[in-house]
């Protein structure tokens, strides 16, 4: 199709080489098409970015995204050629930064409903470059945490080194929806609730003599509880002795509850003690079996192919640890009579 009639928008993604970050393009179709193609909907805070459901079909994306090769080749279908770019209804989500994302991206309605819709498309010229090392060291992260129940703020990473006074007007989106009532480089949240979690996008305009660009940054905001003050507690095994049958396989499960920590480095190991010897056992990886806002339950199993007489003389020890301290639970095997 002819893209010469598409409206054009220039965007700049200055990514940090110090951290992982994502980027989002919105298909800002001109009205009135936008209203019947991109109805914004609400998702739970964990689902990001917002789905933008289609009026006629629940399954089809509303818009089709293309990338225009710089050499003049035909338009490329994003889904087929770029696995690190996810098409999510009316948004295009870049999972990894890099100058190779620089290029022109075109979106248009998936279904043409009227002759007028044929020319309804948006061309986004995206320039991607690493942030210069000269930019301030304390720039805001692309992953920001808000402590539930307290006051917090969300800063626009590309503007966090500027004072509120010198900052340009900022356009904010949350989960794909415009936050029209907030226009400064920092959003203050007087009391943090779970619903403040989500994907925030901040845009501001940067102009030079030749042209004007929208500088965009994406911030993943997580609402968290305060770090635990407790060491982990072992939920299973509860008993210190376990009745077993000789010659049969045996799995002993260790389950422990770890309180929330912003920097979470849980340790869970199985040891065997035999007389004066003690060694760590190679066992399957630990797995998270339940995760909530306040804590996480982690399980790790020790597997014996068959229980031997020697195992009855040994003590099996589950060891768990977080930044506060450690807890152990010992299990002695006893032959079933």
């Amino acid at each position: 199709f002819n893209i010469s009639g598409c409206s054009t928008k220039k965007l700049l993604w200055a990514y940090s080489t110090r951290s992982e970050e994502e980027f989002i393009l919105f298909c800002d179709l001109p009205e009135p098409q936008k209203s019947h193609f991109c109805h914004r909907s609400q998702l739970s805070p964990t689902q990001v970015p917002d789905h933008l459901p289609f009026t006629d079909s629940k399954d089809l994306p509303d818009v089709q995204w293309y990338r225009q090769p710089s050499n003049g080749d035909p338009l490329e279908d994003i889904r087929k050629s770029y696995p690190h770019i996810i098409q999510d209804k009316c948004t295009l989500r870049f999972l990894t930064p890099g100058v190779n994302n620089t290029g022109s991206y075109i979106c248009r309605p998936k279904m043409i409903k009227s002759p007028y819709d044929v020319a309804c498309c948006v061309k986004m010229i995206l320039e991607v470059k690493p942030q210069s090392n000269a930019s301030c060291e304390n720039s805001a992260s692309h992953k920001q945490d808000l402590l539930l129940g307290s006051t917090g703020s969300i800063s626009c990473p590309s503007l966090s080194c500027q004072s509120d006074a010198q900052s340009p007007e900022v356009t904010w989106y949350k989960n794909g929806k415009l936050l029209s009532m907030t226009r400064s480089n920092r959003i203050v949240v007087d009391e943090v609730y779970i619903y403040h979690q989500g994907t925030y996008v901040c845009d501001y305009t940067q102009s030079d003599t030749a042209s004007s660009w929208t500088v965009r940054a994406v911030v993943q905001v997580r609402t968290i509880v305060g770090d635990t003050k407790l060491k982990p507690d072992i939920l299973d095994p509860v008993e210190s002795t376990l009745e077993v049958e000789l010659g049969k396989p045996l799995t002993i499960s260790c389950k422990a509850r770890f309180g929330f920590e912003r920097v979470f480095n849980p340790v869970m190991k199985w040891y065997i003690k035999d007389a004066d010897l003690e060694w760590e056992v190679s066992v399957p990886e630990a797995k998270s079996i339940k995760s909530t806002l306040k804590d996480e339950i982690i399980e790790r199993n020790i597997i014996l192919e068959k229980v031997t007489q020697r195992d009855l003389r040994r003590t099996f020890v589950c060891f768990v640890q977080n930044s506060i301290g450690n807890t152990t639970q010992s299990v002695q095997l006893k032959e079933k009579r």
Epitope: H39, S41, P53, T55, K174, L179, S180, M181, T182, V189
Partner: antibody
Amino acid sequence: QVQLVQSGAEVKKPGASVRVSCKASGYTFTSYYMHWVRQAPGQGLEWMGIINPRGGYTTYAQKFQGRVTMTRDTSTSTVYMELSSLRSEDTAVYYCAKEGRVSPTDYYGMDVWGQGTTVTVSS
Amino acid sequence: DIRMTQSPSSLSASVGDRVTITCRASQSISSYLNWYQQKPGKAPKLLIYDASSLQSGVPSRFSGSGSGTDFTLTMSSLQPEDFATYYCQQSYSTPLTFGGGTKVEIK
């Protein structure tokens, strides 16, 4: 408890302006957006616009654009709505209503309402 | 603008009746729908937000359901104090818009 107290009834001539105040108490004034809604006699509810008390940012319904101005005074926790170039069809009860969730977020529900201010426009 | 259409515009019911009011949006609004009750000479009162969440202090006989374009408010057993006008309102996008109202009268 959370309360919104509005100014008293007004009678205005066509072409004049009216300014209605809404004083908030019992909560952190800057944490919640404030809506203005009006209701003509015997009619339904009509949303006029919203103000963010923290920055003073506003969004108005297209119908009132150019005629309505919403402002706030954080020192007195008061929001104001001024409507100019009044006509007879602006005769209505004007309500301020607090947004139900701490900003910034989507709009949810208006959980606390003022008692209403009757504005009569008559020559 | 998103148009909200309520039906019926009025209904007569008796104490103890189960009453259902419907609201239809002109486009999908996900679950961004609220219900209000208004009595003559009084300000509206929020009953339900997010289509189905009961506002604090509202009796459990009120319930809301729906998503997308079609929504309902149900009063499981009508009480004398429930005779009033009910409005739906979308908070999906500005301008926020209300339905025309449903007047619930005593039979």
